[in-house]
Interface confidence: low
């Protein structure tokens, strides 16, 4: 025997109190799939959250973070305070990156500068709190008579951790 509720489309719920009639979701609620026996309460974007997409009868609201904060987690479940480039967020607030580390974003942690010597390269541009070092040709490549066909290795793309 087919469940009559399966005929109820998204945006409605199957009202068992009314002979399984499909009733529209009440205000501030939604059902994103058919055959639902209840509608879900819409997410409310309050406090540090701001609304990116309004709730509709068939889809939940989507939130962003207010200025000075950024999203964390799936579907922006949390907002975390921004820091400046060259800083990371600790339990005590934003702190400057320690020497030898950098952060080129307003979020995330300070990461160690690339160790150019591991790749047999030399440091072409020194690192700062905000930027990674740029590795250049190895010292051997710079010796007189050495071929200079190898271009300097580019700096890593901002925001990407080394693989």
């Amino acid at each position: 025997l087919q469940d009559l509720c399966s005929n109820c489309p998204a945006g409605t719920f199957c009202d068992n109190n009314r002979s399984q009639i499909c009733s529209p979701c009440p205000p501030n609620s939604f059902s994103s799939a058919g055959g639902q026996r209840t509608c879900d309460i819409c997410r409310q974007c309050k406090g540090v959250f701001k609304t990116r997409k309004e709730c509709s009868s068939t889809s939940n609201a989507e939130c962003d973070c207010i200025s000075g904060y950024h999203c964390l987690g799936a579907e922006c479940s949390m907002c975390e305070q921004d820091c400046k480039q060259g800083q990371e967020l600790t339990k005590k607030g934003c702190k400057d990156c320690c020497f030898g580390t950098f952060n080129d974003q307003k979020r995330g942690i300070c990461r160690p500068w690339t160790n150019c010597s591991l790749d047999g390269k030399s440091v072409l541009v020194n690192g700062t709190k905000e930027r990674d070092v740029v590795c250049g040709p190895s010292p051997a490549d710079l010796s007189p008579g050495a071929s200079s066909a190898t271009p300097p290795a580019p700096a890593r793309e901002p925001g990407h951790s080394p693989q």
Epitope: A10, A33, G34, T58, S161
Partner: antibody
Framework: QVQLQQPGAELVRPGASVKLSCKAS????????INWVKQRPGQGLEWIGN????????NYNQKFKDKATLTVDKSSSTAYMQLSSPTSEDSAVYYC????????????WGQGTTLTVSS | DIQMTQSTSSLSASLGDRVTISCRAS??????LNWYQQKPDGTVKLLIY???RLHSGVPSRFSGSGSGTDYSLTISNLEQEDFATYFC?????????FGGGTKLEIK
Amino acid sequence: QVQLQQPGAELVRPGASVKLSCKASGYIFTSYWINWVKQRPGQGLEWIGNIYPSDSYTNYNQKFKDKATLTVDKSSSTAYMQLSSPTSEDSAVYYCTRFHYGSSPFDNWGQGTTLTVSS
Amino acid sequence: DIQMTQSTSSLSASLGDRVTISCRASQDISHYLNWYQQKPDGTVKLLIYYTSRLHSGVPSRFSGSGSGTDYSLTISNLEQEDFATYFCQQGHTLPRTFGGGTKLEIK
């Protein structure tokens, strides 16, 4: 059953824009996001962007923001992706795929359209 | 963007073998990891979502595990139809990103 139907192949001249289609059936079209994914020959998969047919809200991968435009026609349950000024770099298989909400997986895929950009 | 790395691009195995395919994310993706199978004809199917949940109709010889940044897909008792390419994909953050794929070949 759920189906996402795509033409098997499209040929376009370099520079002439092209519009790929994806016809959905077997489910409520307005309740699922439609995504587009690119695959160059012998390469991996790249997410281009998605559109929510209910209100045409879109998200784009920054890499494709100036290349792809996503639209839907609710009356025919069809999603479209227009590629502007195609070059040989745009020659690839393009898949449409759907997901339900935020972090859901892509649970159904079209067969893919092989786009060839050639003069 | 979150980078997804499948360090093994191809893998050879025999019928009946048990194989594990790994995938690493460049940051914690809180279990929002999905696995897809692509057949040589281009057909793509969802196998596993949210790290370990089997999609409907997928045989139980497929399983997934992992947490944080490291995830894996295991296929036990390999069958002929399992020789294909497998992709991981994160659903944690936009843009959604895929691993480069692991092609499973018959030995």
